[in-house]
Interface confidence: low
């Protein structure tokens, strides 16, 4: 009794599906009640098929709702383990053990990688300095550095931060920003380069003709703030003079106004 595998190395991308197969000899009609199929990954039980049915009680929680034995394939002499929504933690060495009048087992390696494929990008402009801030963000594994380049192949200096993804513990969330004085239609590239030689992933950022007026109050305040403050001071002083007509009250009133201006500044920095 010998199990065979057509492949003992499977490669799958994070979030994808994989079906790993072990073949066993079946003569004529399969007797399900004489068949034992175990699939394990290291110390984790994934499938325990005994007496014609799967025992889900023993299934490791990390494979719950994601791993199943394809029953229709059993009749073709295949113990096929399907894993959906593959995670980085699924990488490792799997063992299929089959008992059917004899017993044998085979090992299969599953490798999982996560390219930094979906690169989010954003371009914003500082209305005071007219400097552009370019941002690229993506998730993947293993850690990546981000290389910024211009259309004339100059390497530019960006700032990259790496955090753990909210989606999965082992996944990295890489964000990189580049501050640069740029003109309309200039092209910049951010390239996510993983340690090791996996394919690099690149996004192209084109400086727009004119950035739309930002919706954020902060930007409005940066433009209108000084003008409004000046107007406020003038009105307050006028009000104080009219109402009290005394220098001391003007001073008090203006002191209060200075405090409120301070609060505005703080608010502006926090916005």
């Amino acid at each position: 009794f010998t199990i065979t595998v057509s492949k003992d190395l499977y490669v799958v991308e994070y979030g994808g599906n994989v079906t790993m197969e072990c073949k066993f000899p079946v003569e004529k009609q399969l007797n399900l009640f004489a068949l034992i199929v175990y699939w394990e990954m290291e110390d984790k039980k994934i499938i325990q098929f005994v007496n014609g049915k799967e025992d889900l009680k023993v299934q490791h929680s990390s494979y719950s709702q994601r791993a199943q034995l394809l029953k229709d394939q059993l009749f073709l002499g295949k113990a096929a383990l399907q894993i959906t929504d593959v995670r980085l933690q699924d990488a490792g060495v799997y063992c299929c053990l089959i008992g059917y009048g004899g017993a044998d087992y085979k090992r299969i390696t599953l490798k999982v990688h996560a390219p930094y494929r979906n690169i989010s990008q954003r371009i914003s402009v500082d209305p005071v300095t007219s400097e552009h801030e370019l941002m690229c963000q993506a998730e993947g594994y293993p850690e990546a550095e981000v290389i910024w380049t211009s259309s004339d192949h100059r390497v530019l200096s960006g700032k990259t931060t790496i955090t753990n993804s909210n989606r999965e513990e082992k996944l990295f969330n890489v964000t990189s920003t580049l501050n640069i004085n740029a003109t309309a239609n200039e092209i910049f590239y951010c390239t996510f380069q993983r340690s090791g030689p996996e394919e690099n992933n690149t996004a192209e950022l084109v400086i727009p003709e004119r950035l739309p007026v930002p919706a954020s109050e902060r930007t409005h305040f940066m433009i209108l703030g000084p003008f409004l403050l000046l107007l406020g001071v003038v009105l307050a002083v006028t009000f104080c003079l009219k109402k009290h007509g005394r220098m001391m009250d003007v001073e008090k009133c203006c002191t209060r106004d200075r405090n409120s201006k301070k609060r505005n500044d703080i608010q502006f920095e926090e916005t």
């Epitope: 190395l9 799958v12 990488a91 490792g92 993983r194 090791g196 996996e198």
Partner: antibody
């Protein structure tokens, strides 16, 4: 950056055993397959097998089954290969090589020369 | 086991010339799941460790000069070194990492004319 530092040259007697080490740094040791490769003087490269340090799982080239034993110590990020019942045929340079994700053998140690001689 | 053959066993070139190294496998190295050929090229200079040049038959490793170009698919593969430099003189091995045991070719020695 990634580095694989192997132990020094060994001169051993026929019939004895030798254990060579490969200390990894600059990457997550447990998540890469660590391979071992043999190269005899003037000869090509021969794949011995790999160990997956996270679980200690091994895969051997049948030719080296029983000859080589691969182990790993996660705490020190070190992989080991023990060669037993040594003969002159085992005289060679042995490399450890780390496999990055799904891509060939990317990072290599400097090699350990094992000479079997009485 | 998958057998890998390389030709020529040695080749002598002058600096600035282009050289083509061949590698053949006894069975296809194309992996249907991702349509990639699991073949790598390695450069080994005398007394040094092998250095990976090409992975997936055509992809250059980080830092490898673009004068090294890998091509081919299935069972026939080629490494082209254009405008050979003195530092390129070395042994070149191709190896498959699709099927266990992983196997390497016997190598091609690149020498100066």
């Amino acid at each position: 950056q990634v580095q694989l530092q192997q132990s020094g040259a060994e001169l051993v007697k026929p019939g004895s055993s030798v254990k060579i080490s490969c200390k990894a740094s600059g990457y997550t040791f447990t998540s890469n397959f660590m391979h071992w490769v043999k190269q005899q003087p003037g000869n090509g490269l021969e794949w011995i097998g790999w160990i997956y340090p996270e679980y200690g799982n091994t895969k051997y080239n049948q030719k080296f089954d029983g000859k080589a034993t691969l182990t790993a110590d996660k705490s020190s990020s070190t992989a080991y290969m023990q060669l037993s019942s040594l003969t002159s045929e085992d005289s060679a340079v042995y490399f450890c090589a780390s496999e990055e994700a799904v891509i060939s053998l990317v990072y290599w140690g400097q090699g350990t020369l094992v000479t079997v001689s009485s | 086991d998958i057998a890998i053959t390389q030709s020529p066993s040695s080749v002598a070139v002058s600096v600035g010339e282009t050289v083509t190294l061949s590698c053949k496998s006894s069975q296809s190295l194309l992996y249907s799941e991702n349509q990639k050929d699991y073949l790598g090229w390695y450069q080994q200079k005398p007394g040094q460790t092998p250095k990976p040049l090409i992975y997936w038959a055509t992809n250059r490793h980080t830092g490898v000069p673009d004068r090294f170009t890998g091509s081919g698919s299935g069972t026939d593969f080629t490494l082209i070194i254009s405008s050979v430099q003195a530092e390129d003189l070395a042994d070149y091995y191709c190896g498959q990492y699709l099927v266990y045991p992983f196997t390497f070719g016997p190598g091609t020695k690149l020498e100066l004319k």
